[in-house]
Every structure is written in structure tokens, then in C-alpha cells.
């Protein structure tokens, strides 16, 4: 039975040209996290973090995605095209798969706020 919940940074905004941290956190389960996959709204993969094999950043994002902090992802040099949904998929044993959603809005405005409160989607 899957007892865990994914907490995410929820809806966040960041400034064009800036950077943002995408974070998910799995709680309320003793399951072992074997892998975390980060994906964009169009199903393209940004990165994979495997517990043993480490990080793998995908070619389209090699220059502007940095692994971490932790199991999270730092997206740099933001463009307006980065606006949209991001998904973290936690592969765990023995529970199975958990998925969290973050919505990122990239703003032209110089007063873009980066809200980073954790919330359960």
C-alpha cells in the first residue's frame, strides 16, 4: 500500500534570465527512493537521478540544468518558453511510483517573486 505523499514547491514564478530550484520531497513512507525523474510538460526529460548510477542530464538541457540541491533540480537562464508544468517522478521500493507537479511561470517583470513554500498538490 502506498502511504507516502509528495510535497512540492507548488506554483512558482521566476524572472526571465534568472534561475529557479525545482524541489519535491517524499514523506510519510519508509520506501527506498531508487530514482527520481524530472520531466517537462511536453513529456521531455530534463534529468534522472539514480541512487547508484548518479545524475544524468538530458542533452537539450545540458547547459542550463544543474543537479540538486538534493534530489531537486536547478533550472538556469530561464526563458519564457520554460513556463509550464514540471513533474518529479519518484521510483521507490517497495511502494512503486509517486508523482509531483510544479507549475513554473517565467515573468518578464523585474519584480518577479520566487515563492518557494512547500505544498501538497
Amino acid at each position: 500500500m502506498m502511504t507516502g505523499t509528495i510535497e512540492t514547491t507548488g506554483n512558482i514564478s521566476a524572472k526571465k534570465g534568472g534561475s529557479v530550484i525545482l524541489q519535491c520531497h517524499l514523506s510519510s513512507t519508509m520506501a527506498q527512493v531508487t530514482q527520481v525523474n524530472w520531466e517537462q510538460h511536453d513529456h521531455s526529460l530534463l534529468a534522472i537521478r539514480n541512487a547508484e548510477l548518479g545524475w544524468h542530464i538530458y542533452p537539450a538541457f545540458k547547459d542550463r540544468v544543474a543537479p540538486g540541491p538534493g534530489l531537486g533540480l536547478t533550472l538556469q537562464s530561464l526563458t519564457m518558453n520554460d513556463t509550464g508544468e514540471y513533474f518529479c517522478t519518484y521510483h521507490t521500493y517497495p511502494d512503486g511510483t509517486y508523482r509531483g507537479r510544479i507549475f513554473l511561470e517565467v515573468l518578464e517583470s523585474s519584480v518577479a517573486e520566487h515563492s518557494a513554500r512547500f505544498q501538497i498538490p
Epitope: T34, Q35, N37, E39, H43, S44, L45, I48, N50, A51, E52, L53, G54, H56, Y58, P59, A60, H91
Partner: antibody
Framework: EVQLQQSGPELVKPGASVKISCKTS????????LHWVKQSHGKNLEWIGG????????NYNQKFKVKASLTIDKSSNTVYMELRSLSSEDSAVYYC????????WGQGTTLTVSS | DIVMTQSHKIMSTSLGDRVNITCKAS??????VAWYQQRPGQSPRLLIY???YRHTGVPDRFTGSGSGTDITFTISSVQTEDLAVYYC?????????FGGGTKLEIK
């Protein structure tokens, strides 16, 4: 030039063990994961497991966890795979390959298990 | 484990033809898919990674597309040297798994 040079063919008896090697060159050893793949009957490909030379992490396909053991010698940029309790089902060609998508492959090591 | 199904075991084609080889994943694999070519007596060779990126030195007649569960590999104009077995592989989650292969042959 990236190269993965594997050890030669092996003929072993059922129940025995064998250790095959894959010596790498032409790139920074710790920068890429290394994997082992089994090809049976010249067709079916199966991922056995992978090794991260950077952190020493090893990830096995559950199917091969008892059968295979992956080790490394950083001083010679070589990875090894030991196969235990061999049977005719283990007769196959075994390849080492680099990276998550296997961008470079060894030439293959043919293992024949026969009495 | 994720099952990668290549429905066509053998595809017959003529030189110069356009060929699509399909691979269906039993679960979502996003774009974590590679395509390999294996000629008789040789090791597999990476052609496409991350579903649509050509590996170094691979001719541009080879392309890959798709994501999720439906992945396609295309040869725009088949040449003699393309007659081989083609395998898809997912590395979205371990254990990484391969399709059963599609053999490309001349009619």
C-alpha cells in the same frame, strides 16, 4: 578515441565461475557509467547492471543479482563481471558498454558453458 | 519491468525506401529511449539517444521521434549498409530494457 577492450572467449564447465574484463581508454574513466549486457542466441539483449566509477555505486537488474557481480579497478580503468554457478542458460555473448545510452560498446566476450 | 515491444520482427524493404520502425513501451518512458543497429557478427552501435538525438557520426537519414509510450525510428532512404537488426531500449527506469529487435531485409 574511446575504446572498450574485452577479454577473450571462455569455455567453462557447468557450476563453475568466470570473470570477464573490460578495459577502457580514450576518455576520463570516472565521467561515465559502465554497463554489462547479455545477448543470447544472437538476438535478445538484456541489461545485467551498471557501475558508476565516480561514486562506486552499482545497480543490478534483479534477474542477475545472484548471478553477476560487478567490480572495478580504477588504477587500470577496467571493469569486471564475475558470473557464478554457470549453466547452459548462461552461454551467450556479453558486452560492456558506456554511458546511460550505450554510446560505445566492447567487442563482446563469448561464454560457452558445456561439460 | 518495462516491456519494449517491436511489433515487426522482420521488415522487408527496397533500397531508397523510407522505413519506420516502431517501439511501444508498456509504461511511460518519456524520451529516455535509444536506438541501436547491429550488423551480423558485430557489436550493437548507438544511432539515436534521448529519443531524437543522433549520436556522433550517424548519417542524417536516421531519425528518431516520439515520447511517452510510442517511439519511432526512421530511415529516410535505405542504403545497403543499413541492412541489420535494430533495437530500441529504454533507460527511464531500471532495469533498463530492450525491444526484441527488427531485422531490416531487402525484398
Amino acid at each position: 578515441e574511446v575504446q572498450l577492450q574485452q577479454s577473450g572467449p571462455e569455455l567453462v564447465k557447468p557450476g563453475a565461475s568466470v570473470k570477464i574484463s573490460c578495459k577502457t581508454s580514450g576518455y576520463t574513466f570516472s565521467d561515465y557509467t559502465l554497463h554489462w549486457v547479455k545477448q543470447s542466441h544472437g538476438k535478445n539483449l538484456e541489461w545485467i547492471g551498471g557501475f558508476n566509477p565516480n561514486n562506486g555505486g552499482t545497480n543490478y537488474n534483479q534477474k542477475f543479482k545472484v548471478k553477476a557481480s560487478l567490480t572495478i579497478d580504477k588504477s587500470s580503468n577496467t571493469v569486471y563481471m564475475e558470473l557464478r554457478s554457470l549453466s547452459s542458460e548462461d552461454s551467450a555473448v556479453y558486452y560492456c558498454a558506456r554511458n546511460w545510452a550505450f554510446d560505445y560498446w566492447g567487442q563482446g566476450t563469448t561464454l560457452t558453458v558445456s561439460s | 519491468d518495462i516491456v519494449m515491444t517491436q511489433s515487426h520482427k522482420i521488415m522487408s524493404t527496397s533500397l531508397g525506401d523510407r522505413v519506420n520502425i516502431t517501439c511501444k513501451a508498456s509504461q511511460h518512458v518519456s524520451t529516455a529511449v535509444a536506438w541501436y543497429q547491429q550488423r551480423p557478427g558485430q557489436s550493437p552501435r548507438l544511432l539515436i539517444y534521448s529519443a531524437s538525438y543522433r549520436h556522433t557520426g550517424v548519417p542524417d537519414r536516421f531519425t528518431g521521434s516520439g515520447s511517452g509510450t510510442d517511439i519511432t525510428f526512421t530511415i529516410s532512404s535505405v542504403q545497403t549498409e543499413d541492412l541489420a537488426v535494430y533495437y530500441c531500449q529504454q533507460y527511464y527506469t531500471t532495469p533498463w530494457t530492450f525491444g526484441g529487435g527488427t531485422k531490416l531485409e531487402i525484398k
